[in-house]
Protein backbone atom coordinates (compact mmCIF):
# COMPACT_ATOMS: atom_id res chain seq x y z
CA UNK A 1 0.00 0.00 0.00
CA UNK A 2 1.02 3.64 -0.43
CA UNK A 3 3.05 5.03 2.43
CA UNK A 4 3.28 8.77 2.87
CA UNK A 5 6.83 9.97 2.32
CA UNK A 6 8.77 12.44 4.44
CA UNK A 7 9.97 14.09 1.34
CA UNK A 8 8.77 17.66 0.76
CA UNK A 9 8.72 21.28 1.98
CA UNK A 10 12.49 21.54 2.05
CA UNK A 11 12.95 18.45 4.22
CA UNK A 12 14.14 15.24 2.61
CA UNK A 13 14.63 11.99 4.45
CA UNK A 14 16.51 8.83 3.46
CA UNK A 15 15.30 5.53 4.91
CA UNK A 16 18.26 3.25 5.60
CA UNK A 17 17.42 -0.38 6.31
CA UNK A 18 19.82 -1.70 8.94
CA UNK A 19 19.26 -5.40 8.52
CA UNK A 20 20.72 -8.13 10.69
CA UNK A 21 21.17 -10.22 7.56
CA UNK A 22 23.64 -8.59 5.26
CA UNK A 23 25.73 -9.37 2.17
CA UNK A 24 28.87 -8.72 4.22
CA UNK A 25 29.34 -9.20 7.95
CA UNK A 26 29.81 -5.53 8.63
CA UNK A 27 29.04 -3.88 11.98
CA UNK A 28 26.02 -1.64 11.46
CA UNK A 29 27.89 1.18 13.20
CA UNK A 30 30.35 1.31 10.28
CA UNK A 31 27.50 1.58 7.80
CA UNK A 32 25.95 4.35 9.90
CA UNK A 33 29.27 6.19 9.81
CA UNK A 34 29.41 5.82 6.02
CA UNK A 35 25.86 7.16 5.67
CA UNK A 36 26.59 10.10 7.97
CA UNK A 37 29.77 10.92 6.08
CA UNK A 38 27.74 10.88 2.86
CA UNK A 39 25.11 13.17 4.38
CA UNK A 40 27.77 15.74 5.27
CA UNK A 41 29.00 15.77 1.67
CA UNK A 42 25.47 16.01 0.24
CA UNK A 43 24.55 18.91 2.53
CA UNK A 44 27.69 20.73 1.40
CA UNK A 45 26.97 20.13 -2.27
CA UNK A 46 23.36 21.30 -1.97
CA UNK A 47 24.40 24.38 -0.06
CA UNK A 48 27.03 25.20 -2.71
CA UNK A 49 24.27 24.97 -5.31
CA UNK A 50 22.21 27.52 -3.37
CA UNK A 51 19.62 24.96 -2.28
CA UNK A 52 18.65 25.63 1.30
CA UNK A 53 17.13 22.28 2.27
CA UNK A 54 17.44 19.69 5.02
CA UNK A 55 18.60 16.15 4.29
CA UNK A 56 18.58 13.49 6.99
CA UNK A 57 18.70 9.72 7.30
CA UNK A 58 16.49 7.50 9.42
CA UNK A 59 18.04 4.19 10.36
CA UNK A 60 15.46 1.42 10.54
CA UNK A 61 16.69 -1.48 12.66
CA UNK A 62 15.34 -5.01 12.55
CA UNK A 63 14.48 -6.47 15.98
CA UNK A 64 16.66 -9.47 15.17
CA UNK A 65 14.44 -11.86 17.07
CA UNK A 66 13.46 -14.07 14.16
CA UNK A 67 15.91 -13.28 11.40
CA UNK A 68 19.20 -13.77 13.16
CA UNK A 69 21.41 -15.97 10.99
CA UNK A 70 23.54 -12.91 10.20
CA UNK A 71 23.98 -13.93 6.60
CA UNK A 72 21.53 -13.70 3.73
CA UNK A 73 19.78 -17.05 4.15
CA UNK A 74 17.00 -15.74 6.37
CA UNK A 75 16.77 -12.29 4.82
CA UNK A 76 13.74 -12.92 2.59
CA UNK A 77 11.15 -11.80 5.12
CA UNK A 78 13.33 -9.45 7.15
CA UNK A 79 13.16 -6.78 4.47
CA UNK A 80 9.40 -7.02 4.27
CA UNK A 81 9.12 -6.87 8.06
CA UNK A 82 11.16 -3.69 8.06
CA UNK A 83 9.01 -2.20 5.32
CA UNK A 84 5.93 -3.02 7.38
CA UNK A 85 7.53 -1.28 10.35
CA UNK A 86 8.19 1.80 8.19
CA UNK A 87 4.64 1.68 6.89
CA UNK A 88 3.13 1.43 10.38
CA UNK A 89 5.25 4.30 11.64
CA UNK A 90 4.53 6.37 8.49
CA UNK A 91 8.27 7.01 8.30
CA UNK A 92 9.11 6.36 4.66
CA UNK A 93 11.76 8.65 3.21
CA UNK A 94 12.29 9.77 -0.37
CA UNK A 95 14.53 6.80 -1.03
CA UNK A 96 15.26 3.41 0.49
CA UNK A 97 18.87 2.38 0.99
CA UNK A 98 19.44 -1.32 1.64
CA UNK A 99 18.79 -4.23 1.57
CA UNK A 100 21.95 -5.93 0.33
CA UNK A 101 20.78 -9.56 0.15
CA UNK A 102 19.45 -10.79 -3.19
CA UNK A 103 16.65 -12.75 -1.50
CA UNK A 104 15.33 -9.76 0.44
CA UNK A 105 15.65 -7.28 -2.42
CA UNK A 106 13.84 -9.59 -4.81
CA UNK A 107 11.02 -10.20 -2.34
CA UNK A 108 10.64 -6.53 -1.39
CA UNK A 109 10.53 -5.52 -5.02
CA UNK A 110 7.98 -8.21 -5.77
CA UNK A 111 5.67 -7.57 -2.82
CA UNK A 112 5.49 -3.80 -2.72
CA UNK A 113 4.20 -1.09 -5.00
CA UNK A 114 7.44 0.77 -5.20
CA UNK A 115 6.86 4.40 -6.01
CA UNK A 116 10.22 5.31 -4.51
CA UNK A 117 13.79 4.40 -5.53
CA UNK A 118 15.67 1.55 -3.86
CA UNK A 119 19.46 1.71 -3.67
CA UNK A 120 21.31 -1.49 -2.81
CA UNK A 121 24.88 -2.28 -1.82
CA UNK A 122 24.67 -5.83 -3.09
CA UNK A 123 21.67 -7.71 -4.53
CA UNK A 124 24.12 -9.45 -6.82
CA UNK A 125 21.83 -12.12 -8.27
CA UNK A 126 20.33 -12.28 -11.76
CA UNK A 127 16.85 -12.16 -10.20
CA UNK A 128 17.51 -8.51 -9.33
CA UNK A 129 18.40 -7.55 -12.92
CA UNK A 130 16.27 -5.11 -14.90
CA UNK A 131 14.26 -3.74 -11.96
CA UNK A 132 12.88 -0.33 -12.82
CA UNK A 133 13.34 1.39 -9.46
CA UNK A 134 16.34 -0.58 -8.13
CA UNK A 135 19.88 0.76 -8.28
CA UNK A 136 22.83 -1.52 -7.43
CA UNK A 137 26.13 0.04 -6.42
CA UNK A 138 28.27 -3.12 -6.31
CA UNK A 139 28.97 -5.11 -9.49
CA UNK A 140 26.12 -7.56 -10.09
CA UNK A 141 26.50 -11.06 -11.53
CA UNK A 142 25.38 -9.96 -14.99
CA UNK A 143 28.46 -7.76 -15.35
CA UNK A 144 30.78 -10.63 -14.43
CA UNK A 145 29.04 -12.92 -16.89
CA UNK A 146 29.46 -10.44 -19.72
CA UNK A 147 33.17 -10.11 -19.00
CA UNK A 148 33.69 -13.87 -18.98
CA UNK A 149 31.88 -14.39 -22.29
CA UNK A 150 33.80 -11.50 -23.84
CA UNK A 151 37.12 -12.90 -22.60
CA UNK A 152 36.30 -16.48 -23.62
CA UNK A 153 35.55 -15.34 -27.18
CA UNK A 154 38.66 -13.16 -27.50
CA UNK A 155 41.26 -14.74 -29.79
CA UNK A 156 43.15 -11.81 -31.30
CA UNK A 157 45.51 -10.82 -28.50
CA UNK A 158 49.22 -11.64 -28.47
CA UNK A 159 48.69 -13.67 -25.29
CA UNK A 160 45.29 -15.23 -26.17
CA UNK A 161 45.05 -16.65 -29.65
CA UNK A 162 42.32 -19.22 -29.01
CA UNK A 163 38.61 -18.71 -28.46
CA UNK A 164 37.40 -20.72 -25.49
CA UNK A 165 34.03 -22.45 -25.30
CA UNK A 166 34.38 -24.65 -22.22
CA UNK A 167 34.79 -24.29 -18.48
CA UNK A 168 34.56 -25.96 -15.11
CA UNK A 169 32.98 -23.92 -12.33
CA UNK A 170 33.91 -24.73 -8.73
CA UNK A 171 31.02 -24.08 -6.34
CA UNK A 172 30.94 -25.86 -3.00
CA UNK A 173 28.19 -23.95 -1.19
CA UNK A 174 30.36 -22.20 1.40
CA UNK A 175 30.77 -19.03 -0.66
CA UNK A 176 30.31 -15.47 0.51
CA UNK A 177 27.13 -13.72 -0.67
CA UNK A 178 28.75 -12.07 -3.69
CA UNK A 179 30.48 -15.28 -4.79
CA UNK A 180 27.32 -17.31 -4.23
CA UNK A 181 25.36 -15.23 -6.75
CA UNK A 182 28.25 -14.87 -9.19
CA UNK A 183 28.66 -18.64 -9.37
CA UNK A 184 24.90 -19.15 -9.33
CA UNK A 185 24.69 -17.05 -12.49
CA UNK A 186 27.40 -19.11 -14.17
CA UNK A 187 25.69 -22.32 -13.13
CA UNK A 188 22.20 -21.34 -14.31
CA UNK A 189 21.37 -23.25 -17.47
CA UNK A 190 19.43 -20.34 -18.96
CA UNK A 191 22.07 -17.69 -18.34
CA UNK A 192 24.06 -15.88 -21.04
CA UNK A 193 27.25 -17.62 -19.90
CA UNK A 194 25.74 -21.10 -20.25
CA UNK A 195 24.16 -20.18 -23.55
CA UNK A 196 27.49 -19.11 -25.04
CA UNK A 197 29.56 -22.08 -23.81
CA UNK A 198 29.60 -25.48 -25.44
CA UNK A 199 30.64 -27.31 -22.27
CA UNK A 200 30.28 -26.33 -18.62
CA UNK A 201 30.38 -28.56 -15.56
CA UNK A 202 30.01 -27.49 -11.94
CA UNK A 203 32.45 -29.10 -9.50
CA UNK A 204 30.90 -29.29 -6.02
CA UNK A 205 33.41 -31.34 -4.06
CA UNK A 206 36.99 -30.46 -3.15
CA UNK A 207 38.09 -33.83 -4.51
CA UNK A 208 36.45 -33.19 -7.88
CA UNK A 209 38.41 -29.97 -8.20
CA UNK A 210 41.65 -31.59 -7.06
CA UNK A 211 41.26 -34.50 -9.48
CA UNK A 212 40.68 -32.23 -12.48
CA UNK A 213 44.06 -30.52 -11.94
CA UNK A 214 45.92 -33.56 -13.30
CA UNK A 215 43.18 -35.46 -15.12
CA UNK A 216 44.33 -36.26 -18.66
CA UNK A 217 40.70 -36.79 -19.69
CA UNK A 218 39.44 -33.45 -18.48
CA UNK A 219 37.00 -31.71 -20.82
CA UNK A 220 38.34 -28.19 -20.18
CA UNK A 221 41.58 -26.58 -19.08
CA UNK A 222 39.75 -23.64 -17.52
CA UNK A 223 38.34 -23.56 -13.99
CA UNK A 224 36.40 -20.59 -12.61
CA UNK A 225 36.20 -20.11 -8.87
CA UNK A 226 35.40 -17.24 -6.53
CA UNK A 227 37.24 -16.12 -3.41
CA UNK A 228 40.67 -15.00 -2.29
CA UNK A 229 44.12 -16.62 -2.65
CA UNK A 230 43.78 -18.25 0.79
CA UNK A 231 40.55 -19.94 -0.32
CA UNK A 232 42.35 -21.32 -3.36
CA UNK A 233 45.29 -22.53 -1.28
CA UNK A 234 43.01 -24.40 1.14
CA UNK A 235 41.59 -26.23 -1.83
CA UNK A 236 44.63 -26.69 -4.04
CA UNK A 237 47.48 -26.65 -1.56
CA UNK A 238 50.80 -27.47 -3.20
CA UNK A 239 49.35 -30.09 -5.52
CA UNK A 240 50.86 -30.43 -8.98
CA UNK A 241 48.83 -28.77 -11.73
CA UNK A 242 48.90 -29.70 -15.41
CA UNK A 243 50.78 -27.05 -17.39
CA UNK A 244 47.79 -26.00 -19.49
CA UNK A 245 45.34 -25.49 -16.62
CA UNK A 246 44.10 -21.91 -16.18
CA UNK A 247 42.30 -20.99 -12.97
CA UNK A 248 40.21 -17.82 -13.09
CA UNK A 249 39.86 -16.53 -9.55
CA UNK A 250 37.01 -14.04 -9.22
CA UNK A 251 37.83 -11.76 -6.30
CA UNK A 252 36.21 -8.46 -7.20
CA UNK A 253 36.05 -6.69 -3.84
CA UNK A 254 39.57 -7.26 -2.65
CA UNK A 255 42.32 -4.74 -3.26
CA UNK A 256 45.06 -6.60 -1.39
CA UNK A 257 46.62 -7.30 -4.80
CA UNK A 258 47.31 -3.58 -5.14
CA UNK A 259 49.45 -3.23 -2.04
CA UNK A 260 53.03 -2.40 -2.91
CA UNK A 261 54.78 -5.06 -0.86
CA UNK A 262 52.60 -7.99 -1.96
CA UNK A 263 54.36 -10.96 -3.51
CA UNK A 264 52.24 -13.58 -5.22
CA UNK A 265 52.51 -17.01 -3.59
CA UNK A 266 53.82 -19.82 -5.78
CA UNK A 267 50.40 -21.50 -5.99
CA UNK A 268 49.06 -18.45 -7.86
CA UNK A 269 51.23 -18.94 -10.92
CA UNK A 270 48.51 -20.73 -12.97
CA UNK A 271 45.88 -18.25 -11.81
CA UNK A 272 44.37 -15.17 -13.41
CA UNK A 273 42.71 -12.96 -10.80
CA UNK A 274 39.68 -10.90 -11.76
CA UNK A 275 39.26 -7.94 -9.46
CA UNK A 276 38.08 -4.34 -9.58
CA UNK A 277 40.39 -1.46 -10.32
CA UNK A 278 41.22 0.16 -6.98
CA UNK A 279 40.01 3.62 -6.08
CA UNK A 280 42.35 6.50 -5.51
CA UNK A 281 41.51 7.80 -2.07
CA UNK A 282 39.43 6.22 0.69
CA UNK A 283 42.38 5.35 2.89
CA UNK A 284 42.07 8.37 5.18
CA UNK A 285 38.31 8.28 5.41
CA UNK A 286 37.00 7.98 8.95
CA UNK A 287 34.56 5.22 8.05
CA UNK A 288 37.05 3.06 6.16
CA UNK A 289 40.12 3.25 8.33
CA UNK A 290 39.46 0.03 10.20
CA UNK A 291 37.79 -1.93 7.44
CA UNK A 292 39.08 -4.88 5.46
CA UNK A 293 39.29 -4.30 1.69
CA UNK A 294 35.97 -6.05 0.98
CA UNK A 295 34.13 -4.21 3.69
CA UNK A 296 35.54 -0.94 2.46
CA UNK A 297 33.72 -1.52 -0.85
CA UNK A 298 30.50 -2.35 1.01
CA UNK A 299 30.62 0.73 3.23
CA UNK A 300 31.63 2.83 0.22
CA UNK A 301 28.54 1.63 -1.65
CA UNK A 302 26.35 2.91 1.21
CA UNK A 303 28.16 6.23 1.15
CA UNK A 304 27.83 6.47 -2.64
CA UNK A 305 24.14 5.65 -2.31
CA UNK A 306 23.73 8.79 -0.24
CA UNK A 307 25.73 10.81 -2.77
CA UNK A 308 23.59 9.44 -5.60
CA UNK A 309 20.43 10.52 -3.79
CA UNK A 310 21.96 13.98 -3.27
CA UNK A 311 22.82 14.16 -6.97
CA UNK A 312 19.26 13.34 -8.04
CA UNK A 313 17.70 15.59 -5.40
CA UNK A 314 19.80 18.51 -6.63
CA UNK A 315 18.77 17.93 -10.27
CA UNK A 316 15.06 17.68 -9.45
CA UNK A 317 15.06 20.69 -7.12
CA UNK A 318 16.96 22.82 -9.65
CA UNK A 319 14.36 21.87 -12.27
CA UNK A 320 11.51 22.61 -9.87
CA UNK A 321 10.29 19.01 -10.09
CA UNK A 322 8.45 16.98 -7.48
CA UNK A 323 10.44 14.31 -5.63
CA UNK A 324 7.56 12.00 -4.69
CA UNK A 325 6.75 10.98 -8.24
CA UNK A 326 7.31 7.90 -10.39
CA UNK A 327 9.62 10.06 -12.53
CA UNK A 328 11.98 10.50 -9.56
CA UNK A 329 11.73 6.82 -8.63
CA UNK A 330 12.73 5.80 -12.15
CA UNK A 331 15.49 8.38 -12.60
CA UNK A 332 18.35 6.61 -10.79
CA UNK A 333 19.93 5.13 -13.92
CA UNK A 334 21.76 5.97 -17.12
CA UNK A 335 23.84 8.67 -15.45
CA UNK A 336 27.22 9.55 -13.97
CA UNK A 337 27.50 11.21 -10.57
CA UNK A 338 30.38 12.36 -8.43
CA UNK A 339 31.02 9.52 -5.99
CA UNK A 340 33.23 9.62 -2.94
CA UNK A 341 36.16 8.28 -4.90
CA UNK A 342 35.53 9.80 -8.32
CA UNK A 343 32.82 9.55 -10.98
CA UNK A 344 30.37 6.65 -10.67
CA UNK A 345 28.47 5.52 -13.77
CA UNK A 346 25.14 3.68 -13.69
CA UNK A 347 23.89 1.80 -16.74
CA UNK A 348 20.42 1.90 -18.29
CA UNK A 349 19.15 -0.45 -15.58
CA UNK A 350 20.67 1.34 -12.61
CA UNK A 351 23.61 -1.02 -12.15
CA UNK A 352 27.05 0.35 -11.41
CA UNK A 353 29.63 0.17 -14.16
CA UNK A 354 33.26 -0.35 -13.34
CA UNK A 355 36.67 -1.26 -14.63
CA UNK A 356 37.55 -4.88 -14.02
CA UNK A 357 41.20 -5.85 -13.99
CA UNK A 358 42.64 -9.25 -14.88
CA UNK A 359 45.91 -9.90 -13.07
CA UNK A 360 48.56 -12.52 -13.67
CA UNK A 361 51.64 -13.53 -11.68
CA UNK A 362 54.91 -12.64 -13.37
CA UNK A 363 57.25 -15.63 -13.35
CA UNK A 364 60.17 -13.17 -13.33
CA UNK A 365 59.22 -11.02 -10.36
CA UNK A 366 56.56 -13.11 -8.51
CA UNK A 367 54.46 -9.94 -8.48
CA UNK A 368 50.90 -9.42 -9.67
CA UNK A 369 50.70 -7.53 -12.94
CA UNK A 370 47.81 -6.22 -15.00
CA UNK A 371 47.15 -8.30 -18.08
CA UNK A 372 44.09 -6.42 -19.31
CA UNK A 373 41.25 -4.22 -18.18
CA UNK A 374 37.56 -4.52 -19.04
CA UNK A 375 35.08 -1.67 -19.11
CA UNK A 376 31.66 -3.01 -18.12
CA UNK A 377 29.95 0.09 -19.56
CA UNK A 378 30.97 -0.65 -23.14
CA UNK A 379 31.60 -4.42 -22.73
CA UNK A 380 35.13 -4.04 -24.09
CA UNK A 381 38.45 -5.61 -23.16
CA UNK A 382 41.64 -3.53 -23.32
CA UNK A 383 44.95 -5.43 -23.27
CA UNK A 384 47.63 -3.74 -21.19
CA UNK A 385 50.58 -6.13 -21.19
CA UNK A 386 51.27 -7.33 -24.73
CA UNK A 387 54.15 -9.63 -23.73
CA UNK A 388 53.29 -11.05 -20.31
CA UNK A 389 55.78 -13.23 -18.46
CA UNK A 390 53.33 -16.12 -17.98
CA UNK A 391 53.95 -19.56 -16.59
CA UNK A 392 52.13 -20.99 -19.63
CA UNK A 393 54.02 -22.22 -22.69
CA UNK A 394 55.24 -19.49 -25.07
CA UNK A 395 53.81 -16.92 -22.65
CA UNK A 396 50.39 -17.48 -24.21
CA UNK A 397 47.19 -18.71 -22.61
CA UNK A 398 46.59 -22.31 -23.65
CA UNK A 399 43.66 -23.63 -25.58
CA UNK A 400 40.72 -24.54 -23.36
CA UNK A 401 40.69 -28.08 -24.69
CA UNK A 402 43.96 -30.01 -24.65
CA UNK A 403 45.15 -31.16 -28.04
CA UNK A 404 42.79 -29.02 -30.08
CA UNK A 405 44.44 -27.01 -32.84
CA UNK A 406 44.07 -23.30 -33.63
CA UNK A 407 40.48 -22.04 -33.70
Amino acid sequence: SQVSQNCHNGSYEISVLMMGNSAFAEPLKNLEDAVNEGLEIVRGRLQNAGLNVTVNATFMYSDGLIHNSGDCRSSTCEGLDLLRKISNAQRMGCVLIGPSCTYSTFQMYLDTELSYPMISAGSFGLSCDYKETLTRLMSPARKLMYFLVNFWKTNDLPFKTYSWSTSYVYKNGTETEDCFWYLNALEASVSYFSHELGFKVVLRQDKEFQDILMDHNRKSNVIIMCGGPEFLYKLKGDRAVAEDIVIILVDLFNDQYFEDNVTAPDYMKNVLVLTLSPGNSLLNSSFSRNLSPTKRDFALAYLNGILLFGHMLKIFLENGENITTPKFAHAFRNLTFEGYDGPVTLDDWGDVDSTMVLLYTSVDTKKYKVLLTYDTHVNKTYPVDMSPTFTWKNSKLPNDITGRGPQ
Partner: nanobody, 123 residues
Protein backbone atom coordinates in the same frame (compact mmCIF):
# COMPACT_ATOMS: atom_id res chain seq x y z
CA UNK B 1 71.91 6.54 -21.83
CA UNK B 2 68.20 6.73 -21.01
CA UNK B 3 66.11 7.77 -23.98
CA UNK B 4 62.40 7.97 -24.88
CA UNK B 5 61.37 8.48 -28.50
CA UNK B 6 57.75 9.17 -29.47
CA UNK B 7 56.34 8.51 -32.92
CA UNK B 8 53.00 8.10 -34.69
CA UNK B 9 51.73 11.68 -34.58
CA UNK B 10 50.17 13.41 -37.56
CA UNK B 11 47.06 15.01 -38.99
CA UNK B 12 43.76 13.23 -38.46
CA UNK B 13 40.11 14.14 -38.97
CA UNK B 14 37.72 14.55 -36.03
CA UNK B 15 36.39 11.13 -35.02
CA UNK B 16 39.52 9.45 -36.36
CA UNK B 17 42.15 7.33 -34.62
CA UNK B 18 45.90 7.34 -34.11
CA UNK B 19 48.39 5.11 -32.32
CA UNK B 20 51.37 6.78 -30.72
CA UNK B 21 54.47 4.78 -29.75
CA UNK B 22 57.08 5.51 -27.13
CA UNK B 23 60.27 3.49 -27.58
CA UNK B 24 62.56 3.31 -24.57
CA UNK B 25 66.27 2.60 -24.50
CA UNK B 26 68.83 2.55 -21.71
CA UNK B 27 66.36 1.06 -19.22
CA UNK B 28 63.58 -1.53 -19.00
CA UNK B 29 60.11 -0.03 -19.37
CA UNK B 30 58.65 -2.77 -17.24
CA UNK B 31 60.28 -1.42 -14.07
CA UNK B 32 59.01 2.12 -14.60
CA UNK B 33 55.80 4.07 -14.35
CA UNK B 34 55.09 5.70 -17.68
CA UNK B 35 52.97 8.75 -18.37
CA UNK B 36 51.61 10.34 -21.51
CA UNK B 37 51.30 14.10 -21.36
CA UNK B 38 50.17 16.70 -23.87
CA UNK B 39 50.64 20.40 -24.39
CA UNK B 40 48.23 22.30 -26.62
CA UNK B 41 49.41 25.59 -28.18
CA UNK B 42 49.41 28.35 -25.56
CA UNK B 43 48.37 25.98 -22.77
CA UNK B 44 50.01 24.22 -19.84
CA UNK B 45 51.20 20.66 -20.14
CA UNK B 46 48.60 18.20 -18.77
CA UNK B 47 48.63 14.51 -17.87
CA UNK B 48 46.62 12.24 -20.16
CA UNK B 49 47.32 8.70 -18.96
CA UNK B 50 49.66 7.04 -16.55
CA UNK B 51 50.54 3.35 -16.53
CA UNK B 52 51.90 2.31 -13.16
CA UNK B 53 54.81 -0.14 -13.06
CA UNK B 54 52.34 -2.86 -12.00
CA UNK B 55 50.44 -2.13 -15.20
CA UNK B 56 47.41 -0.27 -13.83
CA UNK B 57 46.18 2.41 -16.26
CA UNK B 58 44.87 5.69 -14.84
CA UNK B 59 43.13 8.10 -17.20
CA UNK B 60 42.31 11.80 -17.17
CA UNK B 61 38.52 12.25 -17.29
CA UNK B 62 38.79 14.04 -20.64
CA UNK B 63 40.12 10.93 -22.42
CA UNK B 64 38.44 8.12 -20.48
CA UNK B 65 36.72 5.70 -22.84
CA UNK B 66 38.56 7.11 -25.87
CA UNK B 67 42.26 6.56 -25.17
CA UNK B 68 43.89 3.30 -24.07
CA UNK B 69 47.42 2.45 -23.09
CA UNK B 70 49.40 -0.75 -23.51
CA UNK B 71 52.97 -1.93 -23.07
CA UNK B 72 55.05 -4.43 -25.04
CA UNK B 73 58.07 -5.31 -22.92
CA UNK B 74 59.58 -7.50 -25.66
CA UNK B 75 59.92 -4.32 -27.76
CA UNK B 76 60.47 -2.03 -24.76
CA UNK B 77 57.71 0.14 -26.19
CA UNK B 78 54.61 1.82 -24.84
CA UNK B 79 51.54 2.54 -27.00
CA UNK B 80 48.79 5.11 -26.75
CA UNK B 81 45.72 4.28 -28.80
CA UNK B 82 43.56 7.36 -29.41
CA UNK B 83 40.03 6.91 -30.76
CA UNK B 84 37.18 9.37 -31.40
CA UNK B 85 39.65 12.22 -31.63
CA UNK B 86 38.41 15.79 -31.18
CA UNK B 87 39.81 19.18 -32.13
CA UNK B 88 40.64 19.78 -28.46
CA UNK B 89 43.00 16.77 -28.51
CA UNK B 90 45.34 18.74 -30.79
CA UNK B 91 48.66 19.02 -28.94
CA UNK B 92 52.26 17.85 -28.73
CA UNK B 93 52.19 14.47 -26.96
CA UNK B 94 55.09 13.50 -24.70
CA UNK B 95 55.87 10.28 -22.94
CA UNK B 96 57.72 10.32 -19.63
CA UNK B 97 59.15 7.67 -17.33
CA UNK B 98 59.72 7.46 -13.60
CA UNK B 99 61.60 4.85 -11.58
CA UNK B 100 58.51 4.05 -9.54
CA UNK B 101 58.47 3.80 -5.77
CA UNK B 102 54.90 2.52 -5.83
CA UNK B 103 53.75 -0.27 -8.16
CA UNK B 104 50.14 0.91 -8.27
CA UNK B 105 50.21 4.69 -8.06
CA UNK B 106 51.23 7.33 -10.55
CA UNK B 107 54.38 9.17 -9.50
CA UNK B 108 54.20 12.86 -8.56
CA UNK B 109 56.99 13.63 -11.01
CA UNK B 110 58.84 12.02 -13.91
CA UNK B 111 62.60 11.70 -14.39
CA UNK B 112 62.87 11.15 -18.14
CA UNK B 113 61.03 12.84 -21.01
CA UNK B 114 60.80 12.34 -24.76
CA UNK B 115 60.91 15.11 -27.34
CA UNK B 116 57.23 14.81 -28.22
CA UNK B 117 55.16 14.10 -31.31
CA UNK B 118 52.57 16.47 -32.79
CA UNK B 119 48.93 15.41 -33.12
CA UNK B 120 46.61 17.66 -35.11
CA UNK B 121 42.89 16.96 -35.22
CA UNK B 122 41.25 19.01 -37.95
CA UNK B 123 38.92 18.63 -40.90
Amino acid sequence: EVQLVESGGGLVQPGGSLRLSCAASGFTLDDYAIGWFRQAPGKEREGVICLTSGGLPKYADSVKGRFTISRDNSKNTLYLRMNSLRAEDTAVYYCAASGATSRWNCPPQYDHWGQGTMVTVSS
